[in-house]
């Protein structure tokens, strides 16, 4: 059956032979209605990429550099299955490119000019493409030929396989630049030996090199890693201090109509029958015809790449930056230490309008990027299409898991002038009901619920976390009869109460009328039995404070809070009747942009923050008529975090633990991708 056939692309006679053997052996173990293999032979991996894009083939396995080519337009391919190495219990699908230095040296990443460098080899990922790509814009002009620019940047190097005649400085530390193990400084171990022997000041290798060459921890402790934020970390902190995370070997397919489920079904079956130590007659990960045919011989198996993970996310911002710099050879005109405009990520139409107004008023220091969901915004910040946004704590957690860092906190209670330097304790997550109802925390089953959005703190993580510990399952849509929790599956009962309008029904943005704090409260007013919001929501939308037709006549005393002990209290008593304390919303950014974002925002709030009294005739950063656009409307200021500058420290151990527990129930495709 053609639609059940996976056309595998082979790039040599030997690969084609192995592919045919793969096809025949799969035929013998799979049912006739299962997936089948067909073989397509092309002259090169690039030809395979083009063939897949043109629907003449379906799949090929590629190294990281070629995954980048495959992702570029017009190919638009995406990773669907990753090879893994190591054990099934601790599968490695990536390695980390690192810059290793001796502990007793005293320079940082931005002080490499004039140092001596050790590389694994010319044109190799960890040893050349990544470090030189990331340093590209610091190289002296002209940057072409690249080898000459690198020779003029470092005071001496060992770059195995470089041309020692044309670029003698690249071979200064290893005369001749030998391109094999005859050169003692060749490849990973060689580059590390070059550093160890004192020939070089820095070695560009992969994270495992140090461990493979120094079994003794005391010896490893003599070395450190250079981080991109111009700090250093110990060699075992490579996940937080690397130049780039590099995928090892990946199966790619078309982004649309790419048969990814079929490819996974095929490879999953293949690894069951012909994986490591599975079969004598055919081995997926070795071949009598040659090395690394179709798949790497060192692979131990396959893992399905999460569907939310596109090539940009898979390759990572640092890797793409490095390769793009090398390929395109373009650098910003502004010096790299100067802050460029900050691209704010706005959610859908209304936030975009506010962001545009901010952009105009900031004289272009703020630029705007849009996305339809918070997770899409986080992904844009990860891949460099945007730089920053302010997030609820639940999304600060997801952003943190995706490598972003908190930069400033929204403060709600501290009056100026101390606001900017005050760390607030957080706000209260509460459950609100109508005073006329007889609901308590203990009889919510079967009732109608209103949530700010799935994944948000007060509207979801805290109440559902508490609920989970009571009911021990994730079927929250069965616990409540119906509800509105924007971001739920469209056919779920937790989208039933949402108001839309239609194409935006249950979408986690302002186009859904019941989205956010005000939206969840409106849902309670108009349809629901309980709303999970922040403690300020009722006072901010009653007594005429919200002029909208649905809210203008509401009275605060018509609503009460549910306490965890089964009692109820006035909305004026959140300190004695709340579900939990929630961390304030916070601005997040990529590490490389964090300082610029902080500096710019502190400057912007001095101009447009809560010191502006007349918002009808001036732009106000923290005002949007109860819509909480870009920032919560009750923000007094954005405050420095001081030492709370990681997501774990910012959110606090208790909240992180609660959200981690709820991950069993996670509906976050982004979180799944970021923890792959």
């Amino acid at each position: 059956v053609p639609e059940k056939s996976v056309r595998w692309c082979a790039v040599s006679e030997h690969e084609a032979t192995k592919c045919q053997s793969f096809r025949d052996h799969m035929k013998s173990v799979l049912p006739s209605n299962g997936p089948s293999v067909a073989c397509v032979k092309k002259a090169s991996h690039l030809d395979c990429i083009r063939a897949i894009a043109a629907n003449e083939a379906d799949a090929v396995t590629l190294d990281a550099g070629l995954v980048y080519d495959a992702y570029l337009a017009p190919n638009n391919l995406k990773p669907v299955v990753a090879e893994f190495y190591g054990s099934k219990e601790d599968p490695q699908t990536f390695y980390y490119a690192v810059a290793v230095v001796k502990k007793d040296s005293d320079f940082q990443m931005n002080q490499l000019r004039g140092r001596k460098s050790c590389h694994t080899g010319l044109g190799r990922s960890a040893g050349w493409n990544i470090p030189i790509g990331l340093l590209y814009c610091d190289l002296p002009e002209p940057r072409k030929p690249l080898e000459k620019a690198v020779a003029n940047f470092f005071s001496g190097s060992c770059v195995p396989c470089a041309d020692g005649t044309d670029f003698p400085q690249l071979c200064q530390l290893c005369p001749g630049c030998g391109c094999s193990t005859l050169n003692q400084y060749f490849s990973y171990s060689g580059a590390f030996k070059c550093l160890k022997d004192g020939a070089g000041d820095v070695a560009f290798v992969k994270h495992s090199t140090i461990f493979e060459n120094l079994a003794n921890k005391a010896d490893r402790d003599q070395y450190e890693l250079l981080c991109l934020d111009n700090t250093r970390k110990s060699v075992d902190e490579y996940k937080d201090c690397h130049l780039a995370r590099v995928p090892s070997h990946t199966v790619v397919a078309r982004s649309v109509g790419g048969k990814e489920d079929l490819i996974w079904e095929l490879l999953n079956q293949a690894q069951e029958h012909f994986g490591k130590d599975k079969s004598k007659e055919f081995q997926l990960f070795s071949s009598p015809h040659g090395k690394d045919l179709l798949f790497k011989d060192s692979a131990h198996g396959f893992l399905k790449v999460p569907p939310r993970m596109d090539a940009k996310m898979y390759l990572g911002y640092e890797y793409i930056t490095a390769i793009r710099n090398l390929r395109e050879g373009t650098c910003p005109e502004a010096p790299t230490d100067e802050c460029k405009p900050v691209k704010w990520c706005a959610l859908s139409h209304h936030e975009r309008l506010k962001c545009d107004e901010w952009s105009v008023n900031s004289a272009g220091k703020i630029e705007c990027e849009s996305a339809e969901t918070t997770e899409d915004c986080i992904a844009k910040i990860m891949n460099g299409e945007a730089d920053a946004m302010s997030l609820d704590g639940g999304f600060v957690y997801i952003a943190g898991m995706c490598g972003l860092v908190p930069v400033l906190a929204e403060n709600y209670n501290t009056p100026n002038p101390n606001c900017e330097n005050t760390a607030e304790e957080g706000y209260f997550a509460v459950a609100v009901v109508k005073s006329s109802s007889d609901l308590t925390w203990d009889n919510l089953k079967g009732k109608k619920s209103c949530h700010t959005a799935v994944g948000r703190t007060a509207g979801w993580n805290i109440p559902m976390g508490l609920l989970y510990s009571k009911i021990n399952h994730c079927r929250f849509d069965e616990f409540f009869s119906e509800g509105c929790a924007p971001g739920s599956e469209k056919n779920s009962s937790l989208c039933k109460l949402c108001m839309g309008p239609s194409p935006n029904l249950c979408e986690p943005n302002n186009k859904e009328g019941y989205y956010g704090y005000t939206g969840a409260f409106r849902c309670l007013v108009e349809k629901g039995d309980v709303a999970f919001v922040k403690h300020q929501t009722v006072p901010q939308n009653t007594g005429g404070k919200n002029p909208d037709a649905w809210a203008k006549n509401l009275k605060e005393e018509d609503y009460e809070l549910l306490c965890l002990d089964g009692s109820r209290k006035s909305v004026q008593e959140p300190a004695n009747c709340h579900l939990a304390r929630a961390p304030n919303h916070a601005v997040v950014a990529r590490k490389d942009k964090a300082d610029c974002v902080q500096t710019l925002l502190l400057d912007q709030q001095r101009m447009f923050g809560s010191s502006v009294t007349d918002c009808s005739s001036n732009f106000c950063l923290f005002e949007s008529k109860t819509k909480d656009l870009l920032f919560r409307d009750d923000t007094v200021c954005l405050a420095k975090l001081h030492d709370r500058n990681t997501y774990e420290k910012y959110l606090g151990e208790e909240y992180v633990k609660a959200v981690t527990n709820l991950r069993k129930c996670s509906t976050s495709p982004l979180l799944e991708a970021c923890t792959f």
Epitope: H350, L353, E357, V360, N361, S616, S624, K625
Partner: nanobody, 117 residues
Framework: EVQLVESGGGLVQPGGSLRLSCAAS????????MAWYRQAPGKGLELVSG???????NYRDSVKGRFTISRDNSKNTMYLQMNSLRAEDTAVYYC???????????WGQGTLVTVSS
């Protein structure tokens, strides 16, 4: 309610010029940040240029040096002078004010600018 009426669009050759006007009724004009947006066929709405009530201006990169935004508060009118027009400037141009604070959208009918030889 605020009413915004755009005019001045038309067909022009590449390299040519046009001046768009936006007349506003309602008392908000002199205090609001105003902006020109455009929407090319099959594309989303994009900010072209904005002007604050104090007269500071901002432009998207692709129109910098070619377009000039201005306002005349006494006439409740905003202008966009477009020079050195290119085919990629073809779009419906809308003016908006932000006085409504993203609360209600006040958009006019727009004025079509076609740049073609």
């Amino acid at each position: 309610e605020v009413q915004l009426v755009e005019s001045g669009g038309g067909l022009v050759q590449p390299g040519g010029s046009l001046r768009l006007s936006c007349a506003a009724s309602g008392s908000i004009f002199s205090i609001a940040t105003m902006a020109w947006y455009r929407q090319a066929p099959g594309k989303g709405l994009e900010l072209v240029s904005g002007i604050t009530r104090s007269g500071s201006t901002n432009y998207r990169d692709s129109v910098k040096g070619r377009f000039t935004i201005s306002r005349d508060n006494s006439k409740n009118t905003m202008y966009l002078q477009m020079n050195s027009l290119r085919a990629e400037d073809t779009a419906v141009y809308y003016c908006t004010d932000y006085s409504s604070r993203y609360y209600h959208d006040y958009w006019g009918q727009g004025t079509l600018v076609t740049v073609s030889s």
